[in-house]
């Protein structure tokens, strides 16, 4: 029961987190304008992976998309790389989750396979939950480089008929969303993996071992049994060891020398 | 690369009118603002008018009522409507666009100026 509750929570964060992740990648106001300083109090610019906006304190906006892909900054096209790559392990790690859940039955799927597949989708949400928050700090980092070499030259010259306007960008709220996204994929995928240690099989498997006594055709049955974990269970009935006996399973031969009783 | 042309400047008596124009050209994301600053002889630059992209405008006190600013976004163009014209307002006129050029790049591009000469 446990185990059902945290895979299910797990799924449940998870899913909550890649929501995040995907809105996070959309948002326009991953960095807003420190108006502080600025001219014109009026307008507030605020830039977010794909597109860069204007509002005015009427109410005004405009919106539009970035034009070049290779003028725009690497460490821009790095973060909207680990955005993407995000988003995208998160998916499938949404799919493969759906399938290992324990309340849902798929044919006559075994444990161990659900097992195996809610450790994958794990996997996959922690790297997600990763990039997620790789990503945002990236960006962040990016931001408060900028803004420091802003104010270094927040003073400068006319310089000719076009000057650069050193307008300081401060954190949006796309990254908060990114962070607490990004952190809760991660718990999620924790979570996750968790499960996976409660769903994994450990089963006693109990050997009917045959034992042949000489010149007799009945079979002996101790109660001998071999415990084992792990995903490597001897679930099938193997030989266990060699000599006189052999596994129910097994054809019954004909008395020989070797067999003792 | 971005470009105004700014134009309409001359002599006037006191009293008369003049209109001045702007055209931008180039390429940008946004063209927040646009407007005329003025340089006396001897003199800071100063604000004369501004209009943002919503069409808010902002006069400095000493032009309110006697100048009016308009914009046309289609063609990219801004005018200074300037009456009652006083001797103090003899100045050169300079064009101003702040411009959003690309992701995280202002800039602020100037015409070249035109002359405003206001005669008693």
């Known amino acids: 029961m446990a185990v059902t509750a945290c895979q299910g929570l797990g799924f449940v964060v998870s899913l909550i987190g890649i929501a995040g992740i995907i809105a996070a990648t959309c948002m326009d106001q991953w960095s807003t304008q420190d108006l502080y300083n600025n001219p014109v109090t009026a307008v507030f610019n605020y830039q977010g992976l794909w597109r860069s906006c204007v509002r005015e304190s009427s109410g005004f906006t405009e919106c539009r998309g970035y034009f070049t892909l290779l003028g725009l900054p690497a460490m821009l096209q790095a973060v909207r790389a680990l955005m993407i790559v995000g988003i995208v392990l998160g998916a499938i790690g949404l799919l493969v989750s759906i399938f290992a859940l324990k309340c849902i039955r798929i044919g006559s799927m075994e444990d161990s396979a659900k097992a195996n597949m809610t450790l994958t989708s794990g996997i996959m949400f922690i790297v997600s939950g990763l990039c997620a928050i790789a990503g945002v700090s990236v960006f962040a980092n990016m931001l408060v480089t900028n803004f420091w070499m802003s104010t270094a030259n927040m003073y400068t010259g006319m310089g000719g008929m076009v000057q650069t306007v050193q307008t300081r960008y401060t954190f949006g709220a796309a990254l908060f969303v990114g962070w607490v996204a990004g952190g809760l994929t991660l718990i999620g995928g924790v979570m996750m993996c968790i499960a996976c240690r409660g769903l994994a099989p450990e089963e006693t498997n109990y050997k009917a071992v045959s034992y042949h006594a000489s010149g007799h055709s009945v079979a002996y049955k101790p109660g001998g049994f071999k415990a084992s974990t792990g995903f490597g269970s001897n679930t099938k009935n193997k030989k266990i060891y060699d000599g006189g006996a052999r596994t129910e399973d097994e054809v019954q031969s004909y008395p020989s020398k070797h067999d003792y009783v | 690369a971005v470009q105004l042309v700014d134009s309409g400047g001359g002599l006037v008596q006191a009293g008369g009118s003049l209109r001045l124009s702007c055209a931008a050209s180039?390429?940008?994301?946004?063209?927040?603002?646009m407007g005329w600053y003025r340089q006396a002889p001897g003199k800071q630059r100063e604000l004369v008018a501004i209009?943002?992209?919503?069409?808010?405008?902002d006069y400095a006190d000493s032009v309110k009522g006697r100048f009016a600013i308009s914009r046309d976004n289609t063609k990219n163009t801004v005018t200074l409507q300037m009456n009652s014209l006083k001797p103090d307002d003899t100045a050169v006129y300079f064009c101003n666009a702040r411009v959003v050029a690309d992701f995280q790049k202002v800039l602020d591009v100037w015409g070249q100026g035109t002359l405003v000469t206001v005669s008693s």
């Open positions: 180039g390429i940008w994301l946004h063209m927040v603002t």
């Open positions: 209009i943002t992209s919503g069409g808010s405008a």
